[in-house]
């Protein structure tokens, strides 16, 4: 009987214990219901940050798209009436473009076929005194239109036509032979002759658009 | 002992549920916090969605007032005449002159003003990069429209509007107190700071007149 | 590379003066200011001065006005700080370091005013 | 002259945290700022100046923000070798004054 009621004793707290035990595992099965729930909503809310975060970037490039566009358009159409395209200096009859690259007369030349245009030339001493100013703020030397074979040969600008001497005085290796050629530089308002292969910034030189607007 | 028996038999049925009921409770409390960890992350990825969604408007706003901008300036352009006058650079909004004389600060200022114009004035980095590169071919000091009374006050624009200090880093006597203030320059594509009083060239800016006719 | 050398510790008695060099090396010296920075024994950061290795020309802080003279020698690229009528407070380590914001910093000078 | 002020003073956290230091001026001082990182017997090194800009060689998960008067410094992800004490300064005039510090540290 002893025993009987120590068995019984510990048979109550066994059921109690488990009872107990029944109780948490219907709580945490809640609360993970609860959590599951709540995990639910935060994947949902990724889910639609994540679109809306994907629909922006779409928006975005095609805003971007939109903004090249319109730039371009805006250079085309400004360039229609401009005398001369961004970026050069319109003078009298001309626009001018000082290149911020250092090449060889040849490349330099292309440079600015390139850009529809050719190496500066000097047709009268106006022009010598633009230039002269427009650099003189420059200690480098800027590749000319100027060149010629050798010197038994006359300097000829790109055009064919050739230097008048009233314009300026050469200076530097007038006399000399080279294999590619003697080209014409100017520096701090002196023209020099030069290898033509030594790399110089250059100036590009075309006609401005100055028909009426 | 019958009674006995049964019970005790009760008794590990009981033992053996109870620690069923253990042995879930551990495996759901391991889950919880596998749960919880798992929330966590939830969370910290929705913070930072949420964080890029509002850098993506931010960005996608900007590039709405640009592409508004852009699209007032063509309308704007169409029929225009010479952006900018003879011997200045047209870029984009503005036309630029790069003085050919060398003056201190407050008389390159009254050249601008006598031009229509105000010393430069550098808003972007686009801005920036243009002025390197037109500026690349000469080794002399350009003053800007940049200035302090001494350094005890910001660096403010002729407009009265002050630098922002992510556009660039000023070299040169930054600390230094001069009688006639400190004045910013830009030499070989860096702006340096120095006293007003003394002579450099200087860079006009002034809109470009892209005004219907 | 951009480096800044300081000159070795220094044990000071009060009323005593301090020189500490900062040589540079590896960029254009007169282009960039010389700041000084000093750091008492776990305090944080107070800016001294500056100088303009270019020009010559000296920025001091108020308090150290009087007592601070800064100076350089651009035939060896060094800048000075030298701190005249010592007091146990100015025990702290002297640091020199470039432009503003101060991108190269020397490695300290430890000076101890003690008598 | 402008102060600044930052909190907290000392920080704890662990590795993998991320970490927020704020730095108040006295007045509007137009993102003038830097954030300096300094060990114990070493010299400041640059993080980040104009509030938001990171030196070159300076890890990703350092960033900052902030306008006007309040500016904030945060280490997205600490790891071990960002434990240091961190200091902001204003340079837009002078003088050129610093924050008092905030001591980071491991938990």
């Known amino acids: 009987s002893q025993v009987s009621n120590l068995l019984k004793q510990q048979q109550t707290n066994l059921t109690h214990q488990k009872n107990k035990l029944e109780g948490q595992i219907s709580a945490r099965q809640q609360a993970e219901e609860a959590s599951q729930e709540s995990q639910n909503e935060l994947k949902e809310m990724i889910e639609t940050l994540a679109w809306k975060l994907n629909e922006k970037s779409k928006e975005q490039m095609e805003l971007h798209h939109q903004n090249l566009n319109l730039q371009e358009t805006l250079k085309r159409v400004a360039n229609c009436s401009a005398p001369c395209p961004q970026d050069w200096i319109w003078h009298e009859e001309n626009c001018y473009l000082f290149s911020t690259g250092s090449f060889n007369w040849e490349k330099s030349q292309e440079k600015c076929l390139s850009l529809d245009a050719k190496l500066l030339k000097i047709n009268s001493t106006a022009d010598l005194d633009f230039i002269q100013q427009a650099i003189s703020y420059s200690s480098f030397p800027f590749w000319m239109g100027l060149s010629r074979r050798n010197p038994s040969y006359p300097w000829l600008w790109e055009d064919g036509s050739p230097l008048m001497p009233h314009l300026f005085r050469i200076r530097g290796a007038v006399s000399q032979t080279y294999p590619s050629g003697t080209c014409a530089y100017i520096q701090r308002g002196a023209v020099y002759a030069e290898n033509c292969i030594l790399a110089a910034f250059s100036i590009c030189q075309k006609k401005a658009n100055l028909r009426a607007q | 002992s019958q009674v006995s028996n049964l019970l005790k038999q009760q008794q590990t049925n009981l033992t053996h549920q109870k620690n069923k009921l253990e042995g879930q409770i551990s495996a759901r409390q391991q889950a919880e916090e596998a749960s919880q960890e798992s929330q966590n992350e939830l969370k910290e990825m929705i913070e930072t969605l949420a964080w890029k969604l509002n850098e993506k408007s931010k960005e996608q706003m900007e590039l709405h007032h640009q592409n508004l901008n852009l699209q007032e300036t063509l309308k704007r352009v169409a029929n225009c005449s010479a952006p900018c006058p003879q011997d200045w650079i047209w870029h984009e909004e503005n036309c630029y002159l790069f003085s050919t004389g060398s003056f201190n600060w407050e008389k390159s200022q009254e050249k601008c003003l006598s031009l229509d114009a105000k010393l430069l004035k550098i808003n972007s980095t686009a801005d920036l990069d243009f002025i390197q590169q037109a500026i690349s071919y000469s080794s002399f000091p350009f003053w800007m429209g940049l200035s302090r009374r001494n350094p005890s006050y910001p660096w403010l624009w002729e407009d009265g509007s002050p630098l922002m200090p992510h556009l660039f880093r000023i070299r040169g006597a930054v600390s230094q107190t001069y009688p006639s203030g400190t004045c910013a320059y830009i030499q070989r594509g860096a702006v340096y700071a120095e006293n007003c009083i003394l002579a450099a060239f200087s860079i006009c800016q002034k809109k470009a007149n892209l005004r219907a006719q | 590379q951009v480096q800044l050398v300081q000159s070795g510790a220094e044990v000071k008695k009060p009323g005593a003066s301090v020189k500490v060099s900062c040589k540079a090396s590896?960029?254009?010296?007169?282009?960039?200011?010389v700041h000084w920075v000093r750091q008492a024994p776990g305090q944080g950061l107070e800016w001294m001065g500056a100088i303009h290795p270019g020009s010559g020309g000296a920025a001091y802080v108020q308090k150290f006005q009087g007592r601070v003279t800064m100076t350089r020698d651009t035939s060896i690229s060094t800048a000075y700080m030298e701190l005249s009528r010592l007091r146990s407070d100015d025990t702290a380590v002297y640091y020199c370091?470039?432009?503003?914001?101060?991108?190269?910093w020397g490695q300290g000078t430890l000076v101890t005013v003690s008598s | 002259d402008i102060q600044m002020t930052q909190s907290p003073s000392s920080v704890s956290a662990s590795v993998g945290d991320r970490v927020t230091i704020t730095c108040r001026a006295s007045?509007?001082?137009?993102?003038?700022l830097v954030w300096y990182q300094q060990k114990p017997g070493k010299a400041p090194k640059l993080l980040l100046y104009a509030a938001s800009r990171l030196e070159s060689g300076v890890p990703s998960r350092f960033s900052g923000s902030g306008s006007g008067t309040d500016y904030t410094l945060t280490i997205s992800s600490l790891q071990p070798e960002d434990i240091a004490t961190y200091y902001c300064?204003?340079?837009?005039?002078?003088?050129?004054?610093f924050g008092q510090g905030t001591k980071l540290e491991i938990k």
């Open positions: 300064q204003q340079y837009l005039i002078t003088p050129y004054t």
């Open positions: 590896g960029y254009t010296f007169t282009d960039y200011e």
């Open positions: 370091a470039r432009w503003l914001p101060m991108d190269y």
């Open positions: 007045q509007g001082i137009n993102n003038w």
